[in-house]
């Protein structure tokens, strides 16, 4: 069953079918004999009771007040009263945009991330039995879709999908043709979950070492799942049997990003390992960032300012 109209302030477009459904509907069925009344007040007029005789455009069904269609002069406050239950709505009927297939003030905005699932389904459960056909328009151009009862778009979003999508339901009532338009302003944005990966610590690190000993150079980064972290050294990686790239360690952060750590192990340090760059690079779709390590003999430490050392 169609849910009741709980919003106290409603804006609708002139010329379309519209309904108000009160929220004690199940209760109303239990007390069939109870007097149920609908009222309208606008400007100078105080509580005027509504009935089908007051306007050929108004219909009353159980829990619903229907407009066939709603017009500008229907703007005002509406009340439903039953015993000690009252519900009130403030209705604002706005002008239809004659130069467009939709009215800008009646647009629902949605933001969809590129490559994420994007769906538009044209449905209208209340008028479902009366709807002859439904068309879906993008920027007021009709889309040719297979299902003309409930046209649907289901796809992974592309930037080109951005635009105004209007579902137009065509229906007959008492021999007259009406249409109901629901428009979505779809904005496609970049994947907001991606971060710019960051290498942690200083960009240049001098490491004090002793010949013949081993050293572990730790490269850590905060990155996205698809980003890569790797070491570059010498002419061609792997040419030095004393240098080993350890298995990368990854831990997921509470925000769904990754903390990655990759160690370069240099065993039996020799002269050839000194004063050369060992570069750790993180690469992402945004580019690369690199931090460098230089091994320096402990005896030479005095020549370098203390703040550049990593021990």
């Amino acid at each position: 069953a169609e849910s009741c109209t709980s919003r106290p302030h409603i804006t609708v477009v002139e010329g379309e079918p519209f309904y108000l459904k009160h929220c004690s509907c199940s209760l109303a069925h239990e007390i069939e004999t109870t007097t149920k009344s609908w009222y309208k007040s606008s400007g100078s007029q105080e509580h005027v009771e509504l009935n089908p005789r007051s306007s050929s455009r108004i219909a009353l069904h159980d829990c619903v007040l229907e407009f066939w269609p709603v017009e500008l002069n229907d703007t005002g406050s509406y009340f439903f009263q039953m015993k000690n239950y009252t519900q009130k709505w403030k209705l604002n009927v706005i002008r239809r945009n004659k130069h467009s297939c939709f009215t800008e003030r009646q647009v629902t905005s949605k933001i969809v991330e590129v490559k994420k699932f994007f769906q538009i389904t044209c449905e209208n459960s209340y008028y479902q039995t009366l709807v002859n056909s439904t068309s879906l328009y993008k920027n007021c151009k009709k889309l040719l879709l297979e299902n003309n009862k409930n046209p649907t778009i289901k796809k992974n979003a592309e930037f080109e999908d951005q635009g105004y999508y209007s579902c137009v339901h065509f229906l007959h009532h008492n021999g007259k043709l009406f249409n109901i338009t629901k428009t979505f302003n779809i904005t496609i944005v970049e994947d907001r979950s991606n971060i710019v990966p960051v290498l942690l610590g200083p960009k240049l690190n001098h490491v004090a070492v002793e010949l013949g000993k081993n050293v572990r150079l730790n490269c850590s980064a905060l990155l996205n799942e698809e980003d890569v972290i790797y070491w570059m050294f010498g002419e061609e990686n792997g040419s030095d049997p004393n240098i080993h790239e350890e298995k990368e360690m990854r831990i997921m952060t509470p925000e769904g990003k990754w903390h990655a750590s990759k160690v370069l192990r240099i065993e039996n340090i020799g002269e050839s390992n000194l004063n050369v760059l060992y570069n750790c690079t993180v690469a992402s779709t945004g580019g690369t960032d690199t931090k460098s390590f230089i091994l320096v003999r402990k005896a030479d430490m005095a020549d370098i300012p203390g703040h550049v050392f990593t021990r």
Epitope: E190, V196, E226, A283, G286, G287, T288
Partner: antibody, heavy 115, light 113 residues
Framework: QVQLVQSGAEVKKPGASVKVSCKAS????????ISWVRQAPGQGLEWMGW????????NYAQKLQGRVTMTTDTSTSTAYMELRSLRSDDTAVYYC????????WGRGTLVTVSS | DIVMTQSPDSLAVSLGERATINCKSS????????????LAWYQQKPGQPPKLLIY???TRESGVPDRFSGSGSGTDFTLTISSLQAEDVAVYYC?????????FGQGTKLEIK
């Protein structure tokens, strides 16, 4: 609309320099690196290098090191590729492309090097 | 540098038939930390920039017809066109984006038999 718009064709003499621009629109410029790829007439694709739009870091192909410079201007969302000491075998269509797999390409800029 | 080698250099296939292009990398482009293959496939028609078809070795770019599929892992990859259409005549390239320089294969020219 998401696009990369490149500067127009250039004719240069050997030894000269050329600077090709690539203006990005429709997306956050600093979220993606810009790669430059060239294609000599009737040949395959050659990756020249790339620049990180968020930090200006560059990686160049070894064979072009010293002759190529890639820069960005984040205020105008534009990437530039300058190639110096041009030779006849630099005659090619130069493309800019976004990211590390290239879902978005510029239309290409033909650079002709001829005496 | 990672060298990408495509085979065959050219291929002629009848309309509606299956076309298969292979790409081999000189070292693995599979990243064990996330189990992704850093490989893409492109289609290039004369006078146009290349068009991305597949990335992560098997993920089809949105808008690409589902007759295009990518498979493989590590060093051996395949681009398959399940039922060749006239508009598929082009040169196809594989590219690794695992390590800089991000190298391309030499290209495979696909024609109609």
């Amino acid at each position: 609309q998401v696009q990369l718009v490149q500067s127009g064709a250039e004719v240069k003499k050997p030894g000269a320099s050329v600077k090709v621009s690539c203006k990005a629109s429709g997306y956050t410029f600093t979220s993606y690196g810009i790669s430059w790829v060239r294609q000599a007439p009737g040949q395959g694709l050659e990756w020249m290098g790339w620049i990180s739009a968020y930090n200006g870091n560059t990686n160049y192909a070894q064979k072009l090191q010293g002759r190529v410079t890639m820069t960005t201007d984040t205020s105008t969302s534009t990437a530039y590729m300058e190639l110096r000491s041009l030779r006849s075998d630099d005659t090619a269509v130069y493309y800019c492309a976004r990211g590390w797999y290239f879902a978005l390409w510029g239309r290409g800029t033909l650079v002709t090097v001829s005496s | 540098d990672i060298v990408m080698t495509q085979s065959p250099d050219s291929l002629a296939v009848s309309l509606g038939e299956r076309a298969t292009i292979n790409c081999k990398s000189s070292q693995s482009v599979l990243y064990s930390s996330n189990n992704r293959n850093y490989l893409a496939w492109y289609q290039q028609k004369p006078g146009q920039p290349p068009k991305l078809l597949i990335y992560w070795a098997s993920t089809r770019e949105s808008g690409v017809p589902d007759r295009f599929s990518g498979s493989g892992s590590g060093t051996d990859f395949t681009l398959t066109i399940s039922s060749l259409q006239a508009e598929d005549v082009a040169v196809y390239y594989c590219q690794q984006f695992y390590r800089t320089p991000y190298t391309f294969g030499q290209g495979t020219k696909l024609e109609i038999k």
